[in-house]
Structure formats: C-alpha cells, structure tokens
C-alpha cells in the first residue's frame, strides 16, 4: 500500500476547520475490515484518530478529529480537525496498514490575521519640531510573530531606534507592540506595517503629525 | 544493502534479566516493523513481539506478555529487546527481523545466544 | 490464538522430485501468511509472503497458495540446497500479532 499526502503544509485559521488530506490506493475487493489507519503527532507519537478492526475507533485528541467514513473504501483517509488552535500546529503522521503498511506526515500550519494597528502618540501636545517622540504602533490577535516594518512619509524605512515586543495570550495568539523613537521635522507620516509571514497578510497603521492637531 | 547487527552472547542468571540490541543500517529504519524472534536448541522458531518505530507500538506475543519490553531509539536506528525474569527454558538464539516493506521479515540479524544457568 | 499445524513433519524426497507441504490456520488469516527457509546453524529466509507472492531472489521452483485456512508451499523440482526445515507464519490484522507453525523437515531420501 503507498500512501500520498501533500507535500505543502494545509494552512488553517484560528477557529476553522482544516483537512488533513492523505490517501491510499485500495486493491481491487479491498474491503473495510483489512483497513488500519492511524493519524498521530508525529513527534511525540501521541495518537489522535483511528479506525481498527473495521471500525472508527473515533477522537483521542480532544474529540476534535473525524474521518470521512464515506470515503474510506475509495482509499481517502483524510482528517478533519474541528476548531483549529494554535496548540495543533505541527506535523501529523497518517498510518495505512492493509496487507503492508506504509505512513507519511503532513504538516499543519496555523495563522490568525494581526487586527488593523492602533497609533499612539508619547507625548501627545504641544509638539515642536526638534522634539523627540514615542509612537507606539499595536496589533493584536495574530500567529504566528508578526514583522514589523516602519517608514516615514517618503517611504524610507526607519530601521534606527526601533523596539518591537511580541506577547502570547493564553490562546497562544500574538500582541505585538513596536516603539520607533524618532526626532520630529517640521511636519510628517509615521507609518507601520504589521505583516503575517504565514498569510502575507499587511495590516498597516499611520500617524501624521502637522503642528496641531494630530491625525491618525 | 540493509543490515541488522545484533548485540553480543550473553550468560545470564535465572531471576535476572537480558536486554539484546538490533542496529540497522539501510533503508529508513522507522518505516519497517521490527520483530523479534526466538529458538530454543533443537526447537522451532517462536514469534516474541514487534515494533512499528515510526508509531511507537509495541506488540507482543501472549506467552512472553508482561515479561518482554521491545523499544526502538530512532536517532540511533536501534531495537532493543529486554526479557525478564529469565528462567532455564529462556536459553535460546534471539534474533532481529525486519522488511522490505510492511510486515514480512526479509532481512534477519545474526542471532544472540542467551545461556540462562545458575 | 491463532494456532498453525503444519504437515507433514517430516518429507523425504529425492532431489528432482515435487514437495508439498502443507500449513493449516486454526481459524481464517485471509492471506496474511508468510514461508520461511531454514538451514541448520542460519537464520530464517523468507520464500513467500502474503500467501502466494516470491519474496526477492527466490527461484521459480518455489511457490505458495491459499487463502482462509488453508495454505500450500509447493517446491517443482527439489534442489540439494532445498533440504531444510520450512515454517509457514500467520498475522492477525490488528495488531499485528504473528504465529509461526511447528515447522516441515525436508530431508534427503
């Protein structure tokens, strides 16, 4: 028995479902009872669904996992995993055993968008030319880190006095807050582009700064 | 071309225990099962139990359950086999088998004597 | 448990001559059964696997059959070097779990 799956890692959203394709080429008067297959995490080995003995033996991972029963018999052994979080991503190993047996692994890659940044200003008044400012530029809920680029209005990038920090909340999603520190000119835009590297995904943010007031 | 080294003779005590090693070299060792098979003197060939590494399933045999641990260290492509509680009737060659594909041992290591005496 | 009895015990045939050996399953193994070769002082050799396929390198002169219960391991034309002693072993289908039967001496007559 030779068993396929994609090469390319399945993409999956925060809270999608996603497909881990796998397939197997059944020989003709294959029938259901010969059929042993076993998904598992490839690197711990912990089982996650499986059908023995003729049967879905069902879920071991969190009752999140479903075959597609229908399909089986045509040699389709695909996973389904409901619901996906940022703890499922890795390397799934699909099992077929029928009279020999053969594995492969797929990879799970998990992705949420970063929210449209917010701008903030430090300080926020009475701002002249030759001061030196804080703009903070925050983005939340994304995976996996962000990268953050910032330019000024002529689209230099501003590599110089950049602090970036990225937190995981408890769903393992990422903030990401990023402080350029830079010296007013006369006027001009502060602009920052959060990326997902997974999604290429660009959330962008921008302060403007022309005497008073300030726009965002 | 696939090769199965086992580990040395042993002498062992009754009571005691002996862990017996299969090094492979050829082929990835992870997608083969593993068995591990004995002969006593003069007797016929005895299925102890297998492995399958890449699922990190042990199996084995009713009669050696519960004394018999098979394992398998990826990173070195090694077998081991651990019998305990060696009894005189344990005195056998112990040998390592693997496939080509699946399940069918065509590749076989050289046999480790096992001498249980007091 | 799946018990094999193999039969007979003993063959003594002339070289040139046909061998039959036989290997009963105590209850089905579909075509889960493998034949091994062994000779005094070696490790097994696998002759047939899943009931009727060649493994690589073995001559024509070997062959297998059956389905079920019951198997057959036919050699056409006896060789010098086919006197040995042959094990027909089944594997359940999960777990796989494997028997080997008593065993066939082929000797000289």
């Known amino acids: 028995v030779e068993v396929q799956v994609s090469e390319d890692p399945v993409v999956a959203l925060v809270d999608t479902d996603a497909t881990l394709r796998c397939s197997f080429s059944p020989e003709p008067g294959f029938s259901l009872a010969q059929l042993n297959l076993i998904w598992q995490l490839t690197d711990t080995k912990q089982l996650v669904h499986s059908f023995t003995e003729g049967r879905d033996q069902g879920s071991a991972y969190s009752n999140r996992t479903a075959l597609f029963p229908d399909l089986l018999v045509q040699g389709n052994a695909s996973l389904r995993l409901q619901r996906v979080r940022v703890t499922d991503e890795g390397s799934y190993t699909c099992f077929v055993s029928i009279q020999d047996f053969d594995s492969a692994a797929v990879s799970l890659q998990v992705a949420a968008p970063y929210s449209k940044p917010s701008m903030t200003l430090e300080p926020n008044k009475d701002l002249r030319p030759g001061n030196m400012v804080t703009i903070t530029c925050s983005s939340y809920q994304g995976y996996p880190e962000a990268e953050v680029f910032w330019k000024d209005g002529q689209g230099v990038p501003l590599t110089g006095n950049v602090t970036t920090s990225q937190m995981a909340n408890e769903r393992g999603l990422f903030d990401v807050h990023s402080v350029l520190r830079v010296v007013l000119g006369a006027n001009g835009t502060y602009s920052c582009l959060v990326r997902n590297p997974v999604l290429q995904q660009d959330a962008h943010g921008s302060v403007t700064i022309t005497g008073q007031p300030l726009t965002f | 071309q696939v090769q199965l080294v086992q580990s040395g003779a042993e002498v062992k005590k009754p009571g005691s225990s002996v862990k017996v090693s299969c090094k492979a070299s050829?082929?990835?060792?992870?997608?083969?099962?593993i068995s591990w098979v004995r002969q006593a003197p003069g007797q016929g060939l005895e299925w102890m139990g297998g492995i399958i590494p890449i699922l990190g399933i042990a199996n084995y045999a009713q009669k050696f359950q519960g004394r018999v641990t098979i394992t398998a260290d990826e990173s070195t492509s090694t077998a081991y086999m651990e019998l305990s509680s060696l009894r005189s009737e344990d005195t056998a060659v112990y040998y390592c088998?693997?496939?080509?594909?699946?399940?069918?041992?065509?590749?076989w290591g050289q046999g480790t004597l096992v001498t249980v005496s007091a | 448990e799946i018990v094999l009895t193999q039969s007979p015990a003993t063959l003594s045939l002339s070289p040139g001559e046909r061998a039959t050996l036989s290997c009963r399953a105590s209850q089905s193994v579909s075509t889960y059964l493998a034949w091994y070769q062994q000779k005094p002082g070696q490790a097994p050799r696998l002759l047939i696997y899943?009931?009727?396929n060649r493994a690589t390198g073995i001559p024509a002169r070997f062959s297998g059959s059956g389905s079920g219960t019951d198997f057959t391991l036919t050699i056409s034309s006896l060789e010098p070097e086919d006197y040995a002693v042959y094990y027909c072993?089944?594997?359940?289908?999960?777990?796989?779990?494997?028997?080997f039967g008593p065993g066939t001496k082929v000797d000289i007559k």
């Open positions: 050829g082929g990835t060792f992870s997608s083969y099962a």
């Open positions: 899943d009931a009727s």
């Open positions: 088998a693997r496939g080509d594909s699946g399940y069918d041992s065509n590749y």
């Open positions: 072993q089944q594997r359940s289908n999960w777990p796989p779990l494997f028997t």
